[in-house]
Interface confidence: low
């Protein structure tokens, strides 16, 4: 599958729009801080040469791989030591270091504007006018903001986007129209980007066998009715495109997207009888489609796992000639059977199984040794089911609101080192749990919930990663991948922190508060909450509750005041002095 | 039979650089996953850098980022350990080693080698 120009093939394969596209969001997520227009000019130098070698593909550079086309181009911007500090230095290495350190440099947590959204009819007229600088617009401020997002879903968003303004700017209510549909927009692409980081953070820091692991046990689940050869082929296949799209081979990884997605609909009847419907749709919704499809039902009388992994005398005989597989097998048949469990807890069984083989496997009498592991998994599965219960009874009696407060007292404690934001917005995201799993049934309830612990406390990770703070928070992250969750949950209050100083400043609060949004009004609380336990980290339930609803009624009182600024001062000062003698600060 | 043979400590001052090296053999050293790992006198093991089967995904510890490159030739069944800007904190036995696993969502070694000394000192 050699080309002559790697350039030349991509663009050939996905079309300019395509191709263009993707550019600019490899560029953006690459260098976060560049102006709109230089990355455009950027974007529309390198068309242009990739329209060269599709002519000619013995043309001059036409022979260079994309990393050191696409690098160079990175490298001509003027300002890149002014804006970007030591990134500059990546220029100085040759490929492929270069674009290692390229990747190095990429910030989860960029020091960009919030992004603000303007009136409904400022965006249509902006809309109307130039169309095609403003979907790239778009897909420039969403990859730059998230370097990690996943470049063809990125795509698909955008196609979306467009389809949102083209209905909605000509409806006669353009912002009922138009607001509910940017929102969801909104609110998927977070957890997309957020789903896809935990995807590069597995490749990027435990290997690409973490990977196929996670996506052996996830694909087993969705496709029970598929051969284990069949899964382990759309396994290889998946991380080649994942492993791509994390390195910044964006052009490669669309492209590969595509051939297995043609691949999977060409081989639907070996996969999944819940394909068809994702089959029919165009490129781009196809792949999304088959990317969250439903699970397929699960074969009719499975035999028991026992036979092959437990009882067969052949057991040491069959690891010992090819542990992967055999491993692999033993992934695959027990995540088929079990769609009600979470992927992490799969992998978790998984690596207790290999253990005990590692172990029984050099014992006098395997088989005695290994009879019993089955029952090892017992405490295993019986911990996540025991904390979605417990958490889920709490969900409901407190509602999400105060179901996050809960969370972020109880993380706070574990960890008052990391950062307020950080608290608050990681917490959030835990909180979010309540609602959107607790309303499953105890079948569905598992993955839901604990998958997505693993996708919200990878957020914690990575932002924790860029200035690392607590040693605790670290161990939790780098020691096992499918034991992160446990890991936090297992924490208790840190002893050893030392509270915070107290700052008035930081419980001071003005009328602007409150013309903020509902949620806008709930981050002030939780972010004041978080403060008040780093002073007071030993302050109990009870006490935290009774100074929050001090500030939730302070908050009421002086938003309907005529003269709201004296209010805030004056009662606020009262109210600070009243939660310093209830928590005895 | 698998052996893991480290090669390249020495003394060094400060400041000053060296190469590990590690010979492999007894199995197909291309489909693995290899490590560096140091124990400094007195203290716990510590990881050090990883480098995938093929080369393609790097790992290194915060502690020696920008510092050590780990690479690998896999047709001569190697293993490197480029440290440069040696600091006394870097002192310790190195020792290259194995990740079994196919699997492996974990760091975990089946084979080690003997070690080799490296002294950071003035």
């Known amino acids: 599958d050699a080309h002559k120009s790697e350039v030349a093939h991509r663009f050939k394969d996905l079309g300019e729009e395509n191709f263009k596209a993707l550019v600019l969001i490899a560029f953006a997520q690459y260098l976060q801080q560049c102006p709109f227009e230089d990355h455009v000019k950027l974007v529309n130098e390198v068309t242009e040469f990739a329209k060269t070698c599709v002519a000619d593909e013995s043309a001059e550079n036409c022979d260079k791989s994309l990393h050191t086309l696409f690098g160079d181009k990175l490298c001509t911007v003027a300002t890149l030591r002014e804006t970007y500090g030591e990134m500059a230095d990546c220029c100085a290495k040759q490929e492929p270091e270069r674009n290692e350190c390229f990747l190095q440099h990429k910030d989860d947590n960029p020091n960009l504007p919030r992004l603000v959204r303007p009136e409904v009819d400022v965006m249509c007229t902006a809309f109307h006018d130039n169309e095609e600088t403003f979907l790239k617009k778009y897909l420039y401020e969403i990859a730059r903001r998230h370097p990690y997002f996943y470049a063809p879903e990125l795509l698909f968003f955008a196609k979306r986007y467009k389809a949102a303004f083209t209905e909605c700017c000509q409806a006669a209510d353009k912002a009922a129209c138009l607001l509910p549909k940017l929102d969801e927009l909104r609110d998927e692409g977070k957890a997309s980007s957020a789903k896809q980081r935990l995807k590069c953070a597995s490749l990027q820091k435990f290997g690409e066998r973490a990977f196929k692991a996670w996506a052996v046990a996830r694909l087993s689940q969705r496709f029970p009715k598929a051969e284990f050869a069949e899964v382990s082929k759309l396994v290889t296949d998946l991380t080649k495109v994942h492993t791509e799209c994390c390195h910044g081979d964006l052009l490669e990884c669309a492209d590969d997207r595509a051939d297995l997605a043609k691949y999977i609909c060409e081989n639907q009847d070996s996969i999944s009888s819940k394909l068809k419907e994702c089959c029919e749709k165009p490129l781009l919704e196809k792949s999304h489609c088959i990317a969250e499809v439903e699970n397929d039902e699960m074969p009719a009388d499975l035999p028991s796992l026992a036979a092959d992994f437990v009882e067969s005398k052949d057991v040491c005989k069959n690891y010992a000639e090819a542990k992967d597989v055999f491993l692999g097998m033993f992934l695959y048949e027990y995540a088929r059977r079990h769609p009600d469990y979470s992927v992490v807890l799969l992998l978790r069984l998984a690596k207790t199984y290999e253990t005990t083989l590692e172990k029984c496997c050099a014992a006098a009498d395997p088989h005695e040794c290994y009879a019993k592991v089955f029952d090892e998994f017992k405490p295993l599965v019986e911990e996540p089911q025991n904390l979605i219960k417990q958490n889920c009874e709490l969900f409901e009696q407190l509602g999400e609101y105060k179901f996050q407060n809960a969370l972020l007292v109880r993380y706070t404690k574990k960890v008052p080192q990391v950062s307020t934001p950080t608290l608050v917005e990681v917490s959030r995201n835990l909180g979010k749990v309540g609602s959107k799993c607790c309303k499953h049934p105890e079948a569905k309830r598992m993955p839901c919930a604990e998958d997505y612990l693993s996708v919200v406390l990878n957020q914690l990770c990575v932002l924790h990663e860029k200035t690392p703070v607590s040693d605790r928070v670290t161990k939790c992250c780098t020691e096992s991948l499918v034991n992160r969750r446990p890991c936090f949950s297992a924490l208790e209050v840190d002893e050893t922190y030392v509270p915070k100083e107290f700052n008035a400043e930081t419980f001071t609060f003005h009328a602007d508060i409150c013309t903020l949004s509902e949620k806008e009004r709930q981050i002030k609380k939780q972010t004041a909450l978080v403060e008040l336990v780093k002073h007071k980290p030993k302050a109990t339930k009870e006490q935290l509750k009774a100074v929050m609803d001090d500030f939730a009624a302070f908050v009421e009182k002086c938003c309907k005041a005529d003269d709201k600024e004296t209010c805030f001062a004056e009662e606020g000062k009262k109210l600070v002095a009243a939660s310093q003698a209830a928590l005895g600060l | 039979e698998v052996q893991l043979l480290e090669s390249g400590g020495g003394l060094v001052k400060p400041g000053g650089s060296l190469r590990l090296s590690c010979a492999a053999s007894g199995f197909t050293f291309s489909n693995y996953n290899m490590n560096w790992v140091r124990q400094a006198p007195g203290k716990r093991l510590e990881w050090v850098s990883s480098?995938?089967?093929?080369?393609?995904?790097?790992y290194s510890a915060d502690s020696v980022k920008g510092r050590f490159t780990i690479s690998r030739d896999n047709a001569k069944n190697s293993l490197y350990l480029q440290m440069n800007s040696l600091r006394a904190e870097d002192t310790g036995v190195y020792y290259c080693a194995r990740d079994p696993h196919s699997t492996g969502w974990y760091k975990d070694f089946d084979y080690w080698g003997q070690g080799t000394l490296v002294t950071v000192s003035s």
């Open positions: 480098i995938s089967s093929a080369g393609t995904h790097i």
